[in-house]
Interface confidence: low
């Protein structure tokens, strides 16, 4: 096979956020982030080939305590496919509960042409710090 | 390209910890644990392939409770590359808050001679448990 | 090498369960989930290629708050060879504590043969959405 | 410790340039956002720009956009604020500050040098 | 024009109690805006008092609290000693990626 797809993307939104939608972006002005293969397009990730992807995402809240986000619970992360809209679906989804940050990670198969999007629903902001939040794919297999 | 690197470490500390630093060990002593490229160093891994690695870990607080969490946080366990100091930088960052146990990954760019070290700080300490906690990389791509 | 063995799977348990050990399924009627080499037998994912797997998983409590997971402590979830007994071992185990949702993921050997098995003691019931709660493995390297 | 120490300020020409330093002791540089905030005399004070932890992302207030270039080493554990086409009204002691990084997007400055003034004034 | 308001100034006895105030010169203040006060004295930088509405900060007194009073942030000093006396200012996050500050409130203890 070519080499791999892969990205790993930062967190590129402005604040205060007027929907739940993360937008995400790539590149040296954003760290450590990259798209290979993958593009993004306005803040959301595109897959360009066929095949079973690892995808991944860690998001913690900003300026958060155990005491914060239970007072503002229910705060949700929920990753899926938001378009086409006949492939839409939830693929991942966390709450944070007593914690500030969720981390995971699954198998899933995508198609050229999904978008996924990101949702964090609730009213804490997201950290921006590029080692606390990211998210990213990497192409397994056909 | 030929077999990818990987390495899947388990802790490798005497106790009481002097300093924030965990040291990894790898071997038929240390469980399930192995390195195929990257090397150990006093501890930590060496990255001897240049590439974009999966960055994974998984730390488990030893004689933990939510209450023993929250009593003494901030337990913050933090994975970076710390030489060259030129390239010195944090790559994944996670603080216990209630819990007493974090895990996540991210895929990042990574070089040859590229240190990768955890910092665990906090009074806590982590439970050597291999099924507890453990450390990995795996290379994915040039 | 042929195409990586993986496998992500869904949760396919009778409730109320009769005892800790979880259920897994694949295919169309249990969402996004599939087996490309190792095979399901009793709901339990047997592998069919030897080498070094990542082992991921997702398991959330279904109705649960922070007060719910905390009352009803110990809630832990442990994945493990549980066949044959001659390699019978823990591979990564993690607690719920005030959380309701664990996620991590690991590097590990694996052997044509090995059966892997997921437990989770306590009385609280997993989640059966699909974006919630799944287990999956990647083949990585021999 | 953290210390932080801020040096190049003096006395500079309208549309002229300067460039100030910050040194930074007692805690991991590379993992902390960093801020120039700058107080006019007898005045309050005004942010004027940020650097994430890695150097890769620079926000700045309007007043100094295009103008004024934030920038950090993390080898050298040393932050830099470059200053052009300098004006009147640039004039204050500028302060180098730690963002206390509590994963936010809101800055919040725990830790502060004891600042370097700049005078622009022909 | 300021967008944060602050009292230009305020005066305290010892051991009195004092509440300073921030509000925006266009609508009310609230925990989105992640209210935070720094304490400044003569010829020295300032320092981190409370950050989100009402954390305080390391090592700074108890006689210190943050709190939204109405629609404006307030910060109040219980028990006011001498060295108290310094000027206050409050920063608020109004847009990524900037704090406001306030044009900052002095101090007075009498004694």
């Known amino acids: 096979h070519p080499e791999p797809h892969t990205a790993e993307l930062q967190l590129n939104l402005t604040v205060p956020r007027k929907d739940p939608t993360l937008r995400w972006g790539a590149g040296p002005a954003l760290g450590r982030s990259f798209t290979h293969g993958p593009e993004l397009e306005e803040g959301h990730l595109r897959i360009h080939r066929d095949g079973i992807y690892m995808v991944h995402i860690q998001v913690t809240l900003a300026i958060c305590s155990s005491t914060t986000a239970s007072r503002h619970h229910p705060t949700t992360l929920a990753v899926g496919i938001c378009s086409p809209a006949s492939r839409s679906i939830s693929l991942l989804r966390l709450s944070f509960h007593q914690g500030c940050t969720i981390a995971s990670q699954r198998l899933t198969p995508l198609a050229r042409g999904d978008t996924l999007c990101t949702n964090l629903t609730g009213t804490l902001l997201p950290s921006r710090n590029t080692d606390e939040t990211f998210f990213g794919v990497q192409w397994v297999r056909p | 390209h030929p077999e990818p690197h990987t390495a899947e470490l388990q802790l490798n500390l005497t106790v009481p910890r002097k300093d924030p630093t965990l040291r990894w060990g790898a071997g038929p002593a240390l469980g399930r644990s192995f390195t195929h490229g990257p090397e150990l160093e006093e501890g930590h891994l060496r990255i001897h392939r240049d590439g974009i690695y999966m960055v994974h870990i998984q730390v488990t607080l030893a004689i933990c409770s939510s209450t023993t969490a929250s009593r003494h946080h901030p337990t913050t366990l933090a994975v970076g590359i710390c030489s060259p100091a030129s390239r010195s930088i944090s790559l994944l960052r996670l603080s216990f808050h209630q819990g007493c146990t974090i895990a996540s990954q991210r895929l990042t760019p990574l070089a040859r001679g590229d240190t990768l070290c955890t910092n665990l700080t906090g009074t806590l300490l982590p439970s050597r448990n291999t099924d507890e906690t453990f450390f990995g990389v795996q290379w994915v791509r040039p | 090498h042929p195409e990586p063995h993986t496998a992500e799977l869904q949760l396919n348990l009778t409730v109320p369960r009769k005892d800790p050990t979880l259920r897994w399924g694949a295919g169309p009627a249990l969402g996004r989930s599939f087996t490309h080499g190792p095979e399901l037998e009793e709901g339990h994912l047997r592998i069919h290629r030897d080498g070094i797997y990542m082992v991921h998983i997702q398991v959330t409590l279904a109705i649960c708050s922070s007060t719910t997971a905390s009352r009803h402590h110990p809630t832990t979830l442990a994945v493990g060879i549980c066949s044959p007994a001659s390699r019978s071992i823990s591979l990564l185990r993690l607690s719920f504590h005030q959380g309701c949702t664990i996620a991590s993921q690991r590097l590990t050997p694996l052997a044509r043969g090995d059966t892997l098995c997921t437990n989770l003691t306590g009385t609280l019931l997993p989640s059966r959405n699909t974006d919630e709660t799944f287990f999956g493995v990647q083949w990585v390297r021999p | 410790e953290v210390q932080l120490v801020e040096s190049g300020g003096g006395l500079v020409q309208p549309g002229g340039s300067l460039r100030l330093s910050c040194a930074a002791s007692?805690?991991?540089?590379?993992?902390?956002?960093m801020n120039w905030v700058r107080q006019a005399p007898g005045k309050g004070l005004e942010w004027v720009s940020d650097?994430?932890?890695?150097?890769?992302?620079?926000y700045y207030a309007d007043s100094v956009k295009g103008r004024f270039t934030i920038s950090r080493d993390n080898s050298k554990n040393s932050l830099y604020l470059q200053m052009n086409s300098l004006r009147a009204e640039d004039t204050a002691v500028y302060y180098c500050?730690?963002?206390?990084?509590?994963?936010?997007?809101?800055?919040?400055?725990?830790?502060w040098g004891q600042g370097t003034l700049v005078t622009v004034s022909s | 024009q300021a967008v944060v308001t602050q009292e230009p100034s305020l005066t305290v006895s010892p051991g009195g109690t004092v509440t300073l105030t921030c509000g925006l010169k266009?609508?009310?203040?609230?925990?989105?805006?992640?209210p935070t006060w720094y304490q400044q004295t003569p010829g020295q930088a300032p320092r981190l008092l409370i950050y989100n509405t009402n954390t305080r900060h390391s090592g700074v007194p108890d006689r210190f609290s943050g709190s939204i009073l109405g629609n404006k942030a307030a910060l109040t000093i219980t028990g006011a000693q001498a060295d108290d006396e310094a000027e206050y200012f409050c920063a608020l996050f109004i847009s990524n990626p900037s704090v406001e500050f306030g044009g900052g409130t002095q101090l007075t203890v009498l004694g």
């Open positions: 500050a730690r963002d206390a990084g509590y994963s936010n997007h809101v800055p919040i400055f725990d830790s």
């Open positions: 007692g805690f991991t540089f590379s993992v902390y956002y």
């Open positions: 266009s609508g009310s203040v609230t925990s989105d805006n992640f």
């Open positions: 650097i994430n932890n890695e150097g890769g992302t620079t």
